[in-house]
Amino acid sequence: SIPWNLERIIPAWQQTEEDSSPDGSSQVEVYLLDTSIQSGHREIEGRVTITDFNSVPEEDGTRFHRQASKCDSHGTHLAGVVSGRDAGVAKGTSLHSLRVLNCQGKGTVSGTLIGLEFIRKSQLIQPSGPLVVLLPLAGGYSRILNTACQRLARTGVVLVAAAGNFRDDACLYSPASAPEVITVGATNAQDQPVTLGTLGTNFGRCVDLFAPGKDIIGASSDCSTCYMSQSGTSQAAAHVAGIVAMMLNRDPALTLAELRQRLILFSTKDVINMAWFPEDQRVLTPNRVATLPPSTQETGGQLLCRTVWSAHSGPTRTATATARCAPEEELLSCSSFSRSGRRRGDRIEAIGGQQVCKALNAFGGEGVYAVARCCLLPRVNCSIHNTPAARAGPQTPVHCHQKDHVLTGCSFHWEVENLRAQQQPLLRSRHQPGQCVGHQEASVHASCCHAPGLECKIKEHGIAGPAEQVTVACEAGWTLTGCNVLPGASLPLGAYSVDNVCVARIRDAGRADRTSEEATVAAAICCRSRPSAKASWVHQ
Amino acid sequence: QDEDGDYEELMLALPSQEDSLVDEASHVATATFRRCSKEAWRLPGTYVVVLMEETQRLQVEQTAHRLQTWAARRGYVIKVLHVFYDLFPGFLVKMSSDLLGLALKLPHVEYIEEDSLVFAQ
């Protein structure tokens, strides 16, 4: 029978599919930075090249005895999870091992850097097919390790890293916190976060998705035919590295941005019980478990979007938070969220030639998050249309006046703190389709984009009664690009996108006697790409 | 995903310029020193000296050599363990923490990061 972890990540209808080239080989190469490995194990024999790379610290303790099977345990198991004959994900994939962890599973940032540089040098000396680098290790936050990952990713290498086993925010660890790395948390057979003794999987906004990481059967270094189960975010990352290898084998032209977006789009959503995570991390942690996406031939051409959260701004009055998309992605909208509700809104601005999403804290606020909606859309061209704050008078609509440009998102901010002003409606599709509507004292920013066949519409859902949140989802075939809260009588905490659902959060005043005009509304901008059609705004 | 983690960044007090070797680096240090926030994971004595992105390969080697020369003047032994160039310009150096202030004044230095442990997950 198929082990639970493989059944979970490769849907039954895909399990018969041939994921290597006609001769059974794979053009994708996976580099594993880990302990030494037992290359003679039946699971991985003939698939693994042990490079001469070795950069490890001395083992601690005078009484430490190097036992080959113990030294090889972690790396051998992971090599088996990636490409093992029976228990592996990408069964035909060739793997290169670099030793950066000693017999106690310890390494150094510097050793890892030298390992990453070794891979880059190998790539320059002998260019090959797509490369995947698996980093089943974690240390404290390291700017230089993150930078090295970023630079390697820019050369076309896909890096997959363990989120870490510290039951903590993955952003505090490296390489997990590197934005260019695909960071993987661990779930068990019940799709719940993995507990490891008193600790467990890391979580938070630096995690891209989760994958099986508990009691994973794989190659054991005890003997060449032995198997054992191991647990951790390393195992989870190995599953995703295997999935990525399969995706690249089918379609070697896939970029890192496309791979990440497709992993997110086709993951299993909302199966993880978020109560396991600290309360303040639940909104930031993705509720998705990896599965092998279908090939691009079956699903190509669609608009792919993901949500990127900023770091918390901190509580100072002028604090800001900035969320950035990957270089290939387009920022289609920007929103903000504050647990206290004290925020001065959000806006898109250019920093160093890149559009970023910025959220502004307000006096007395505990801090804000910026929430960017980052999308992949061929030949897209976006611009921001701003209306400065009106000192008095009616609301000022901002629309996309350029030909064939459609509204993909609305942002707004106040130069001065005005909580009452925030309770005024912002975006209305009725009567004024395709425009952002501001009000006095708010600056309004419309995100207007042009791409072949891009069409968008606003979808709203309002709740008149007491509620902490209102949601609205884009229907099948449409992708959420923008999300706003249109407040009723309550103070809005902000809005953010969770996959294809727009979530408007409010601090409920508890009044049950509201009129429908006072209803809190979640307003989603839903778009789709139909390459044959012209860009258009769809009137609901 | 993250810009700066829970991370220690320190501006170090700099030694005075007292001999001709140091006069070459008479600019004020804007470089910072960084180290792991978890003390038990730190590896003091080994540092990655990270240079500005546009630094040329020859300048990397010259900077490492200059640091060695300056340090030797003061009686400090430095071991340049590795020179980085393919992913970022910089070098890995084994040296006394006493020399950090001096190293931060070197031309082209963006920041210096103390080495730290990573662990199998």
Epitope: - | P15, S16, E18, Q68, A72, R73, R74, G75, Y76, V77, K79, S96, S97, D98, L102
Partner: antibody, heavy 114, light 108 residues
Framework: QVQLVESGGGLVQPGGSLRLSCAAS????????MHWVRQAPGKGLEWVSN????????YYADSVKGRFTISRDNSKNTLYLQMNSLRAEDTAVYYC???????WGQGTLVTVSS | DIVLTQSPATLSLSPGERATLSCRAS???????LAWYQQKPGQAPRLLIY???SRATGVPARFSGSGSGTDFTLTISSLEPEDFAVYYC?????????FGQGTKVEIK
């Protein structure tokens, strides 16, 4: 100009103690490693000990380990060598030297004899 | 420990002659930390050469150093009367710091 002046030498009985000082001037003392080197009468140079600029790192020759202690007071620009359990073979001229041994003091004679 | 062996123990030469002093290490020495000193009776040693080949401030050009790995040489191209003294090589790249036993350059 750089100057190093040793003091504290003298005659001491075996098993006794002595504390040598080296007063430094003309340079930023705390930037430099400092060393003690000795020379027995008619013999060659023997390195004894050194200390880093901050005082955080010290090294000793095996022949003096556990008996001698090097220290420094950067506020006073002074280097010290505390010598305990002295032996006849410790008889020598003791020099302090700066950094890369580019400047030396004139030396102070320590005689261990009963 | 790195043992430095100097040869010859004594070198008897006349002023104007060329002196070649050798220093051999028991294991490879980082040449950045190889130095030569001159010592005259009743005086402290004086640094002549650092980094195996760089002349210290104020040292005449007739003194030169060369070598790498385990073999190093101090050359005095033309001996002056004030050059007759004891010369020591030293390595300070590894602890313990070690000196050679010295070469005495005397007037023939």
């Amino acid at each position: 100009q750089v100057q190093l002046v040793e003091s504290g030498g003298g005659l001491v009985q075996p098993g006794g103690s002595l504390r040598l000082s080296c007063a430094a001037s003309g340079f930023t003392f705390s930037d430099y490693y400092m060393h003690w080197v000795r020379q027995a009468p008619g013999k060659g140079l023997e390195w004894v000990s050194n200390i880093s600029g901050s005082g955080s790192t010290t090294y000793y020759a095996d022949s003096v380990k556990g008996r001698f202690t090097i220290s420094r007071d950067n506020s006073k620009n002074t280097l010290y060598l505390q010598m305990n359990s002295l032996r006849a073979e410790d008889t020598a001229v003791y020099y302090c030297a700066r950094g890369m041994f580019d400047f030396w003091g004139q030396g102070t004679l320590v005689t261990v004899s009963s | 420990d790195i043992v430095l062996t100097q040869s010859p123990a004594t070198l008897s030469l006349s002023p104007g002659e060329r002196a070649t002093l050798s220093c051999r290490a028991s294991q490879s020495v980082n040449s950045n930390y190889l130095a030569w000193y001159q010592q005259k009776p009743g005086q402290a040693p004086r640094l002549l050469i650092y980094g195996a080949s760089s002349r210290a401030t104020g040292v005449p050009a007739r003194f030169s150093g060369s070598g790498s790995g385990t073999d190093f040489t101090l050359t005095i191209s033309s001996l002056e009367p004030e050059d007759f003294a004891v010369y020591y090589c030293q390595q300070w790249g590894d602890v313990p710091i070690t000196f050679g036993q010295g070469t005495k350059v005397e007037i023939k």
